[in-house]
């Protein structure tokens, strides 16, 4: 899968509509185990004069908790700028609107800088043919396949998509 | 161990551009990502950008974003610092090295000499 490391280029507005998380991965293992800050999933995103707003579902207490983030664009043109956590410098690494997306996010909170990368698709029975793209952006940007989570059903919290 | 040397460095007035160029020795070169650092006198060695293994993902510090440009080409083991729109602040000491991923966290003390970048006003 040969990605073009850059926003789609039809726009950002593509990247709307529904989306399945499939694989986290990171530096920080705790960020994306069970309870982790960054074991979210994303529901649905929109994109509204360069930015991208996204919906995505937290688990909490057994339920999942839906919340919507706004990534704002910066004089990059792949790059934006997220509060969630503390701040974030939200890279989209690689597009192919209508069936996978890899972001990837260099956190900084306090002190603390980490490094979390997503996997999304627009089908999950597609799924395993975009593992293979997701392990090859994490390799490239420092990440290792044992740091690689993939998500189950049950993971992704499922029963809250409506 | 990885060998790097640091070059390009100058005296340069404000606003003015530099190349730095940094060359490791070793095979392994493009199983790296690699970053450049700074230190200035009296402070702390400080990350000033990364770039992936492949050479195709990036990532700036705030206070170089826009105008400083991480490139690197596997095939000559060389990483480069294009730095455009020079300023005093700009002033330190500038180090290449490997690093574990994106973030800038160091993998092993592997630095180079360094080569001295000086911004008049």
């Known amino acids: 899968q040969e990605g073009n490391h850059e926003e789609p280029q039809g726009g950002l507005e593509e990247l709307s509509g529904r989306w399945h998380s499939v694989a986290l991965a990171s530096n920080k293992s705790d960020l994306i185990k069970p309870w982790g800050h960054f074991r979210v999933f994303i529901h649905s995103m929109s994109a509204k004069d360069g930015n991208l707003h996204g919906d995505i579902l937290i688990p909490q207490d057994g339920q999942c908790e839906k919340v919507s983030l706004t990534a704002f664009k910066t004089a990059t043109s792949n790059k934006f700028d997220l509060e969630y956590w503390g701040h974030n410098d939200l890279y989209l690494a690689e597009v192919d609107p209508k069936s996978y997306l890899i972001l990837y996010m260099i956190n900084q909170y306090n002190d603390d800088t980490s490094l979390v990368a997503h996997l999304m698709v627009r089908d999950l029975s597609r799924q395993q043919d975009f593992l293979p793209a997701f392990e090859s952006v994490c390799e490239d940007i420092g990440l290792h396949k044992d740091q690689i989570v993939v998500l189950s059903d049950d993971d992704r919290c499922q029963g809250s998509r409506d | 161990a990885v060998q790097l040397v640091d070059s390009g460095g100058g005296l340069v007035q404000a606003g003015d551009s530099l190349r730095l160029s940094c060359v490791a020795s070793?095979?392994?070169?493009?199983?790296?990502?690699m970053g450049w650092f700074r230190q200035a006198p009296g402070k702390e060695r400080l990350i000033v950008a990364t770039?992936?293994?492949?050479?195709?993902?990036?990532h700036y510090a705030d206070s170089v974003e826009g105008r400083f440009t991480i490139s690197r080409d596997n095939a000559k083991n060389t990483v480069y610092l294009q730095m455009n729109s020079l300023e005093p602040e700009d002033t330190a000491v500038y180090y290449c090295?490997?690093?574990?991923?994106?973030?800038?966290?160091?993998?092993?003390?592997?630095w180079g000499q360094g080569t001295q970048v000086t911004v008049s006003s």
């Open positions: 070793g095979r392994t070169f493009s199983s790296y990502v």
């Open positions: 770039i992936s293994k492949s050479g195709s993902l990036t």
């Open positions: 090295t490997p690093v574990s991923d994106l973030t800038g966290r160091r993998l092993g003390s592997y």
